[in-house]
C-alpha cells in the first residue's frame, strides 16, 4: 500500500512559554509529510500545519482560546514521493501527544525588572507585566491578567558589596523593600506559581543593580 514507507511520528513534545505553544516531534521526514490535529477532550479534531515537512507546529492560536482546557494533539504521517508501491493507501499513521493543559503547564518566561526607584531607605522594584498571546475582547492579556493571584514574584536582592541575599515576595508586580542608606543593591526576580506541581518557577531575571540606568534615585 502507499503507506509502506511512512514512519509514525515519535517523541511528541509540547514546548510552551507564556502560552506561546509549539508541538515538536521526530523524525525529519523522508518521502513523507505531516499534518497535525488538535482537540480538546470534548471538541473536534482540527487540522493545522497541513502537509508540512517541518517537525514542529505552532498551536498557540488554538490553545489560547481557553488556556484552562486540556488539549491533545496528533501528528499524521502521509506518504509523499518515492514510496515502495503505489496503490490505495489505508488509514494514515498517526501518533498522539501527551495531554497538555496550558494554564497548569506553560513555562513561565524569564521576567524582566522594569524599573526601581529609591526614596530614602525604601526601594520600589517593578516587574514588567509581560504580554501573552491570550486574547480577551480583541486585546492581548498580560501574564498577571491571565494568572491573577496565582502568580507571585520573588525578589532576590543583595548589597553590591556583599554576597548575602535577601528575599521578598509579592502577588502584584511591585515590591517595596527596606535598604540601608548609602548602599547600592542588586536585584533579580523570579516568577512563581506556588499552586503548581510542575513548571512552578521561571528562570531568574537578568540582574539589575543600583547606580545603573534602570533606576531612579531620590535621596530624602
Amino acid at each position: 500500500s502507499g503507506t509502506t514507507n511512512t514512519v509514525a511520528a515519535y517523541n511528541l513534545t509540547w514546548k510552551s512559554t507564556n502560552f506561546k505553544t509549539i508541538l515538536e516531534w521526530e523524525p525529519k521526514p523522508v518521502n513523507q509529510v505531516y499534518t497535525v490535529q488538535i482537540s480538546t477532550k470534548s471538541g473536534d479534531w482540527k487540522s493545522k500545519c497541513f502537509y508540512t515537512t517541518d517537525t514542529e507546529c505552532d498551536l498557540t492560536d488554538e490553545i489560547v482560546k481557553d488556556v484552562k482546557q486540556t488539549y491533545l494533539a496528533r501528528v499524521f504521517s502521509y506518504p509523499a514521493g518515492n514510496v515502495e508501491s503505489t496503490g490505495s493507501a489505508g488509514e494514515p499513521l498517526y501518533e498522539n501527544s501527551p495531554e497538555f493543559t496550558p494554564y497548569l503547564e506553560t513555562n513561565l518566561g524569564q521576567p524582566t525588572i522594569q524599573s526601581f526607584e529609591q526614596v530614602g531607605t525604601k526601594v520600589n522594584v517593578t516587574v514588567e507585566d509581560e504580554r501573552t498571546l491570550v486574547r480577551r475582547n480583541n486585546t492581548f492579556l498580560s501574564l498577571r491578567d491571565v494568572f491573577g493571584k496565582d502568580l507571585i514574584y520573588t525578589l532576590y536582592y543583595w548589597k553590591s558589596s556583599s554576597s548575602g541575599k535577601k528575599t521578598a515576595k509579592t502577588n502584584t508586580n511591585e515590591f517595596l523593600i527596606d535598604v540601608d542608606k548609602g548602599e547600592n543593591y542588586c536585584f533579580s526576580v523570579q516568577a512563581v506559581i506556588p499552586s503548581r506541581t510542575v513548571n512552578r518557577k521561571s528562570t531568574d531575571s537578568p540582574v539589575e543593580c543600583m547606580g545603573q540606568e534602570k533606576g531612579e534615585f531620590r535621596e530624602i
Epitope: 502507499g2 509529510v33 499534518t35 471538541g43 473536534d44 479534531w45 482540527k46 487540522s47 497541513f50 502537509y51 508540512t52 515537512t53 482560546k65 499524521f76 502521509y78 506518504p79 509523499a80 514521493g81 518515492n82 514510496v83 503505489t86 490505495s88 493507501a89 494514515p92
Partner: antibody, heavy 117, light 106 residues
Framework: EVQLVQSGAEVKKPGESLKISCKGS????????MNWVRQMPGKGLEWMGM????????RLNQKFKDQATLSVDKSISTAYLQWSSLKASDTAMYYC??????????WGQGTTVTVSS | EIVLTQSPATLSLSPGERATLSCSAS?????MNWYQQKPGQAPRIWIY???NLASGIPARFSGSGSGTDFTLTISSLEPEDFAVYYC?????????FGGGTKVEIK
C-alpha cells in the same frame, strides 16, 4: 454517505450581492475544513480558500480577499461563499470540496454564477 | 505563491500510446496532487502525495517527481483516460493549481 450539495445556478447583474451555499451531510460537518474552488469558463481551477466550520477560521487566497467572503452555519451544516458587489469577472463555476487526505475526495456538484448586465 | 506550470497544454495521442504530463513548480514542493476532470463534472482526485494512486485508479497511471518537477504518466491510454489533468500543490498557502493539460484523442 458523504455528500456536498450546492445551491442552484445564479444569474445576477454587476453590483448585486450573492450568497451561494454548500450543504454537507453524512459526516461530522464541523470537523473538516471546507475548500472553495473557482473555475472560470474554459479555464483551470483556482483555490479560493477554506473555512473550518467549528470556529469559522479561514485561510483565504489573498487574490480573493477583497472579492469574496467565506462563512458557515453550523446548525444546518452549510458553508457559504458570498459577494457584496458582483463583477462580470466573477462569472464562473464554484465548487466546494471537503479537505481530505488521500483517496477521500468529496466535491459539490458546482454552482454556476453568471454576472451580466 | 507557488506557480505551477503544466506542459504541454494539450496532448494529442491515440489509445494505447504512452502519455507524459509535466508540472513544474516555481519553488520546491513536498506535497503534490493530480486531479482528473471531464466536461460537465467536478474534478476528481487521481494521484495524491506525488505518487499514490487514489482509490479505484488503474495501475497504468503513475506519479513521480520531487522538488520542482513532477510527472503524471499513463503507460497505455484507454478511451476513458481522455480528459483534463490538473496538478495541485499543498506545500504552502495559498494552495495552487496548474493550468491543466488536456489529453485528447488524436
Amino acid at each position: 454517505e458523504v455528500q456536498l450539495v450546492q445551491s442552484g445556478a445564479e444569474v445576477k447583474k454587476p453590483g448585486e450581492s450573492l450568497k451561494i451555499s454548500c450543504k454537507g451531510s453524512g459526516y461530522s460537518f464541523t470537523s473538516y475544513w471546507m475548500n472553495w474552488v473557482r473555475q472560470m469558463p474554459g479555464k483551470g481551477l483556482e483555490w479560493m480558500g477554506m473555512i473550518y466550520p467549528a470556529d469559522s477560521e479561514t485561510r483565504l487566497n489573498q487574490k480573493f480577499k477583497d472579492q469574496a467572503t467565506l462563512s458557515v452555519d453550523k446548525s444546518i451544516s452549510t458553508a457559504y461563499l458570498q459577494w457584496s458587489s458582483l463583477k462580470a469577472s466573477d462569472t464562473a463555476m464554484y465548487y466546494c470540496a471537503r479537505e481530505d487526505y488521500g483517496s477521500s475526495d468529496y466535491w459539490g456538484q458546482g454552482t454556476t454564477v453568471t454576472v451580466s448586465s | 505563491e507557488i506557480v505551477l506550470t503544466q506542459s504541454p497544454a494539450t496532448l494529442s495521442l491515440s489509445p494505447g500510446e504512452r502519455a507524459t504530463l509535466s508540472c513544474s513548480a516555481s519553488s520546491s514542493v513536498s506535497y503534490m496532487n493530480w486531479y482528473q476532470q471531464k466536461p460537465g463534472q467536478a474534478p476528481r482526485i487521481w494521484i495524491y502525495g506525488i505518487s499514490n494512486l487514489a482509490s479505484g485508479i488503474p495501475a497504468r497511471f503513475s506519479g513521480s517527481g520531487s522538488g520542482t518537477d513532477f510527472t503524471l504518466t499513463i503507460s497505455s491510454l484507454e478511451p476513458e483516460d481522455f480528459a483534463v489533468y490538473y496538478c495541485q500543490q499543498k506545500s504552502s498557502f495559498p494552495w495552487t493549481f496548474g493550468g491543466g493539460t488536456k489529453v485528447e484523442i488524436k
